[in-house]
């Protein structure tokens, strides 16, 4: 079998809401993946599991099941959304994200994603990690790749 390539493209959008009483930030982060099937037969993308970390704390998890089938030598772009919560244990972040004296409230999040594919009963897992900038101060849509954090901090491919 040839490889199945998973490429994390970046954050597509981040929608933010707040609970001032509990100093909580809710961020719905939509990410984009490109999955390429280099085989001469179809493969099934069985599930995608994702988690988001802020400052070594997991702030959100998501799992998508029975996603799609990718045909021979084909590529599909898949969007997945991770709902995240930065709760009052990090209430200083609420103050930062709602500070009106600054325009952009970028925070660095680590995006982790694992894609499970199956073909002929065989299962394969491919994982990616990426640091991304996300603006926690407003709803934002990004050009793909625009939210990339400094490349030097990215894990090796």
């Amino acid at each position: 079998p040839r490889s199945i390539d998973v490429k994390y493209i970046g954050v597509k959008s981040a929608y933010v809401s707040y609970d001032v009483q509990k100093r909580t930030i809710y961020l719905n982060i939509t990410n984009t993946l490109n999955i390429t099937n280099n085989n001469y037969y179809s493969v099934e993308v069985e599930n995608i599991t994702a988690q988001v970390q802020f400052s070594k704390t997991v702030i959100g998890k998501a799992r998508l099941n029975n996603i799609t089938i990718i045909g021979p030598l084909d590529m599909k772009q898949i969007d997945y959304t991770v709902p995240t919560v930065i709760a009052e244990e990090m209430s200083y972040m609420y103050d930062f994200c709602t500070l009106i004296s600054i325009k952009v409230h970028n925070i660095v999040l680590m995006m982790q994603v694992t894609v499970t594919t199956t073909y002929f009963g065989h299962s394969e897992q491919i994982s990616q990690e990426r640091y991304q900038y996300v603006d926690c101060g407003r709803n934002t849509t990004y050009q793909l790749g625009q939210s990339e954090y400094l490349n030097v901090l990215q894990p090796q491919q």
Epitope: V20, Q21, T24, Y26, A87
Partner: antibody, heavy 117, light 112 residues
Framework: QVQLQQSGPELVKPGASVKLSCKAS????????VNWVRQRPGQGLEWIGW????????IYNEKFKGRATLTVDTSSSTAYMELHSLTSEDSAVFFC??????????WGQGTSVTVSS | DVLMTQSPLSLPVSLGDQVSISCRSS???????????LEWYLQKPGQSPKLLIY???NRFSGVPDRFSGSGSGTDFTLKISRVEAEDLGVYYC?????????FGGGTKLEIK
């Protein structure tokens, strides 16, 4: 230790308004929220409302909406609650409480309000 | 509104006793952010309430370790392992998860 000093007892006529104050011993109200709580004689505690001093955002118990007005003067670290259209049902002790996201950690000593003609 | 029901209403004790106070909410009080904002306050006669426990089981600073909180979902308990004279008063549970925030009716801890 944070101390919240509330204004003295009030005797007011039915239909009138009263404005109670709650002064912090430090500049606590620039960093913390304030809740107000009512306790009728021999009764339990009832949450009135909450204020976020940084921008004056308020949230009220529906029961008190339109009758209670919460404000904060951060320069003097004083919180205020004004209660309008008082009836005998409003005769109670009113407490202010400094509030973290997790809980009401320090309370004032309470202000007694008596509504009587 | 979330109704907070405490039991018993009155709890006669002897000094040194271990006691439990129950608090039941009419619906789950897990906040949208995942935390459970269940607090316990003690009000001594003629005084303002004092915070004992926050977020179900966290003791507030200066609160003796004979006080402990537990529970989840809709059922919560405050335990006092050895009652002392200074513990007498009315105990209130409180939920700060769903608006309007609500108190329980109170449990009066008194000497037998």
């Amino acid at each position: 230790q944070v101390q919240l000093q509330q204004s003295g007892p009030e005797l007011v006529k039915p239909g009138a308004s009263v404005k109670l104050s709650c002064k912090a011993s430090d500049n606590t109200f620039t960093n913390y929220d304030v809740n107000w709580v009512r306790q009728r004689p021999g009764q339990g505690l009832e949450w009135i409302g909450w204020i976020y001093p940084r921008d004056g955002t308020t949230i009220y118990n529906e029961k008190f909406k339109g009758r209670a007005t919460l404000t904060v003067d951060t320069s003097s670290s004083t919180a205020y609650m004004e209660l309008h259209s008082l009836t005998s049902e409003d005769s109670a002790v009113f407490f202010c409480a400094r509030t973290l996201p997790q809980a009401m950690d320090y309370w004032g000593q309470g202000t007694s309000v008596t509504v009587s003609s | 509104d979330v109704l907070m029901t405490q039991s018993p209403l009155s709890l006669p004790v002897s000094l040194g006793d271990q006691v439990s106070i129950s608090c039941r909410s009419s619906q789950t009080i897990v906040h949208r952010n995942g935390n459970t904002y269940l607090e316990w306050y003690l009000q001594k006669p003629g005084q303002s309430p004092k915070l004992l426990i926050y977020k179900v089981s966290n003791r507030f600073s200066g609160v003796p370790d004979r006080f402990s909180g537990s529970g989840s979902g809709t059922d919560f308990t405050l335990k006092i392992s050895r009652v002392e004279a200074e513990d007498l008063g009315v105990y209130y549970c409180f939920q700060g998860s769903h608006l309007p925030w609500t108190f329980g009716g109170g449990t009066k801890l008194e000497i037998k």
